[in-house]
């Protein structure tokens, strides 16, 4: 059990208050951490609050400025760039927001040993991404979607790729599908360890249907924003892999890189690119059918100056109970002979483990094992891997950070994190210097999360980099909701839940019980992290006890659960929650006339099911942005988890699956159905659908839509979403306002 | 106050070679990322060389392989030895802080390779 205590006692209660609603849209109660910018073993970089980048030298205990904020604000920088010569630092600013990932800026370079603005040959604007050589200062630019080489920030630029165009052909970024479904990030270009190589991707979207959305804005015509977009089953983009030598790039050109034969006879997808030497590349590739990766080895051929893939050297990943990777296909981490490597996969039981390739993946040395999961391999040194996992204390919900000695034989395993602050911190990530001389420590929670300095080699603290003074003392007069993380064992199930109860919870009493629901495949909610949020305000000031559960489908607890929504998807989810609340009921605490659920994108996906479940359980719900129907989302994700929508695959689970064929469902429920105009991501198109199905079958709801808005909803939408979706539950639970 | 004084630079044939010393003082110490800078005529100044404190180096390409950066924290110096000099390393040669602070530079030390 986590209890996070209320801190509330008979003679200070006069002083303590509840969360207001107000505290939440403030941000009131928001926590700062510290990652490192590491520019080597024992340097790195950070914004002060006054916005000076500051060097701290961890040996020598000393720090300069080495960008002062004037020359910051000279050209409203919020973000940098020092190069790895130390000479160069480019500066961000005109931030415009695109997708998840992507956004476009200008740059302008600043010369620290002249301590000006390089000019000339400037760099144009917009740029959609841009970033140094590891080595040097070279540069790589994609301009309306071409990549350019600068050489030198003063130079003129080289252009490497001259195809791009507008929603057709994206050179060094993917398009919208790759960014949000496969790459997650806004970069599609990889430079080779020392500069001298640049691979990049090129994605051609031509045939690609589009999706259209009005932008109504304020002129006296909406725009029409269109985006190419593969829904489940539609025409997905082609990827091609290129790589041009830097140092002379005009020499051959860009030069591709070959598929694998078996992954290139029918659709498929690039999946990642690892650098392993200058003249040595990984890529991944997976078939359109997710179940099956190929990781293949490519080397330079100077004589041909040309890419060479073996077949010995390409490695097969296949799931045959489910998609291949957990959320995606896991990268490999080469060790220093550069040809093997350390990854994480399934093993024979089940769970996701360290492997070690040497040669064959059928030959790969188990290196972790057990029944919990290895979450990520963050560094490998000459004689150490560090990795995170819930392995401790068998919570899958937390997060410890563990080194493995690989230099000595047999292989010893110490947990990094698990005592340094038990009580407080049970949640961890962790950031890395060269060679991991150093590293910091980012703890996340139950408590309040803090962020420190340690040793690479003795992982003794050296010093704490935030531990969020001001909140705590911020917190020390508010009655924060107590909350624990428990399981429930239901027909060979584990079912986890996280319960966040009312300050002066008394379990002979009865609570309206509200259920907060994501539940999409390979996610998972029940975490042992801080969190100070509207369901925090909603269990101290209204009384609500609020329950978070991971169901089937949920991650990190073997393949059984993660698998078992694999081509069935809106199924389980729904009935783990369904049997959770059961059981929750059983505790004897709930008011089985005052339960809720509400979740967001695909938690509105299930919650909307789950209204719809005909069990006669809940009263109301809340959809905001949820998918009605698979045959609407996007390719790369749907089809991991269902397949295609076609007669011989799985069209018949497709058309079972969707909200719309539940609308009868909903006479006996107050539903509220919340949407942006402009969701890129989760298109407006799926609450229009159950809005009119609603609407045909003549079911009363209540709905809200944020014109201009997109998945996320921010800005002054947030604040209206939240006290909308208030008064919604305590009008349902018949609370007073 | 911080102080960096450069010295051991003059006049030599093209093939020969100098050592450059860099005498730190005041509140820094050679300990830091250390790096030696150069300023030909009409020219911007460009970095040459650095000595991150765990004794990784980085060479400017058109020194690569000819010049090397060392330090000696008993005596808070840094030193830049300079072999194969070719015309083109006419400059005047800086030491500072890597990546440089622009209120240190120190006089440099002229450097004139004669071919």
């Known amino acids: 059990i986590v209890l996070r205590p209320s801190r509330v006692h008979n003679s200070e209660e006069n002083t303590m208050r509840a969360l207001t609603l107000k505290d939440i849209l403030n941000g009131t109660f928001s926590y700062k951490t510290f990652f490192p910018n590491w520019i080597s073993g024992q340097e790195y970089l950070h914004q002060s609050a006054d916005n000076n980048i500051v060097l701290y030298n961890i040996e020598t205990g000393q720090s300069y400025t080495i960008l002062s904020n004037r020359t910051m604000k000279s050209v409203n920088a919020s973000n940098y760039g020092l190069s790895p010569d130390r000479q160069f630092v480019y500066l961000e600013s005109d931030y415009s927001k695109l997708w998840r990932y992507s956004y476009t800026a200008t740059y302008y370079i600043y010369d620290l040993s002249n301590g000006e603005f390089v000019r000339g040959n400037e760099l144009p604007r917009p740029i959609q991404y841009l970033c140094w050589s590891p080595v040097g200062s070279k540069l790589a630019y994609v301009y309306q979607n071409n990549i350019y080489l600068k050489q030198r920030p003063g130079d003129p630029p080289f252009q490497i790729t001259f195809n791009g165009r507008e929603n057709k052909i994206f050179n060094g970024i993917p398009d919208w599908v790759y960014e949000e479904e496969m790459l997650a990030t806004k970069y599609a270009l990889w430079w080779s360890p020392n500069g001298k190589f640049l691979a990049y991707a090129e994605f051609n979207d031509t045939d690609i249907p589009v999706i259209a959305y009005s932008y109504y804005g304020d002129e006296q015509y909406p725009r029409t924003i269109n985006i190419p977009y593969p829904k489940a089953g539609a025409k997905n983009p082609v990827v091609r892999i290129f790589i041009i030598d830097t140092t002379y790039p005009a020499y051959v050109g860009p030069q591709e890189v070959p598929v694998p034969a078996m992954i290139a006879s029918s659709d498929y997808y690039f999946s990642w690119l690892t650098w392993v030497t200058d003249e040595r590349v990984c890529l991944q590739w997976l078939k359109r059918v997710q179940n099956v990766s190929v990781l293949s080895i490519c080397d330079f051929r100077e004589d041909w100056q040309t890419w060479d893939c073996p077949k010995t050297q390409e490695h097969i990943e296949e799931s045959r109970t489910g998609w291949a990777g957990g959320f995606f296909v896991s990268t490999p981490v080469f060790s220093y002979d550069a040809i093997s490597y350390y990854k994480i996969f399934s093993d024979k039981d089940g769970y996701k483990h360290i492997h070690y390739i040497k040669d064959t993946v059928e030959n790969a040395i188990q290196i972790t094992s057990g029944k919990w999961e290895a979450i990520n391999i963050f560094r490998v040194t000459q004689d150490s891997l560090f990795y995170s996992s819930n392995e401790f204390e068998e919570y899958p919900g937390r997060r410890n950070i563990y080194r493995i000695s690989i230099g000595s034989y047999p292989p010893s395993k110490k947990c990094v994190t698990c005592h340094l602050r038990k009580e407080r911190c049970q949640y961890y990530t962790a950031s890395f210097s060269d060679y991991a001389k150093y590293y910091a420590l980012v703890c996340y929670g139950p408590g309040i999360p803090i962020s420190t300095l340690h040793d690479g080699r003795t992982d003794q603290e050296i010093k704490i980099l935030e531990e969020n003074k001001e909140l705590e003392n911020a917190l020390k007069n508010i009655q924060l909701p107590k909350e624990e993380i428990k399981k429930l064992e239901v027909d060979e199930i584990t079912l986890w839940y996280k319960m966040i109860l009312p300050p002066q919870f008394d379990r002979s009493k009865k609570y309206p019980l509200l259920i907060q629901v994501y539940g999409g495949p390979c996610s998972q909610s029940v975490r042992s992290v801080f969190a100070v949020n509207w369901i925090s305000y909603l269990a101290s000031k209204e009384g609500m006890v609020i329950a978070l559960v991971d169901g089937r489908g949920t991650a990190f607890q073997g393949d059984k659960l993660l698998y078992a929504v694999y081509r069935k998807l809106g199924v389980y989810e729904v009935e783990d929650q369904i049997t959770a609340v059961r059981k929750f009921i059983e505790m004897g605490f709930i008011d089985e006339k005052r339960i809720a659920i509400w979740g967001w994108s695909y938690g509105g996906y299930v919650s909307s099911l789950a209204l719809a479940s005909g069990t006669g359980l809940f009263k109301c719900g809340i959809a905001v942005a949820p998918v009605s129907s698979w045959e609407y989302y996007a390719s790369v994700y749907t089809e991991r988890f269902m397949g295609l929508p076609t007669k011989d695959d799985n069209l018949e689970h497709y058309k079972n699956s969707t909200v719309m064929a539940r609308a009868e469902y909903f006479r006996n429920v107050d539903y509220l159905l919340i949407h942006g105009t402009a969701d890129d991501n989760v298109h407006f198109q799926n609450s229009a659908q159950i809005a009119k199905a609603l609407v045909n079958a003549q079911v009363d709801f209540q709905a809200m839509w944020y014109s201009d808005q997109n998945h996320g909803l921010s800005g002054l939408s947030t604040n209206h979403l939240y006290t909308h979706m208030t008064h919604f539950l305590k009008q349902c639970f018949s609370l007073s306002d | 106050q911080v102080q960096l004084q450069e010295s051991g630079g003059g006049l030599v044939q093209a093939g020969g070679s100098l050592r450059l010393s860099c005498a730190v003082s005041?509140?820094?110490?050679?300990?830091?990322?250390m790096g030696w800078y150069r300023q030909a005529p009409g020219k911007q100044r460009d970095v040459v060389a650095g000595l991150t404190t765990g004794g990784r180096s980085h060479y400017a390409d058109s020194v690569k392989g000819r010049f090397t950066i060392s330090r000696d924290n008993a005596k808070n110096t840094v030193y830049l030895q300079m072999n194969s000099l070719k015309a083109e390393d006419t400059a005047v040669y800086y030491c500072?802080?890597?990546?440089?602070?622009?209120?240190?530079w120190g006089q440099g030390t002229q450097v004139t390779v004669s071919s």
């Open positions: 500072n802080l890597w990546p440089p602070v622009q209120g240190y």
């Open positions: 005041g509140s820094i110490s050679s300990a830091n990322s």
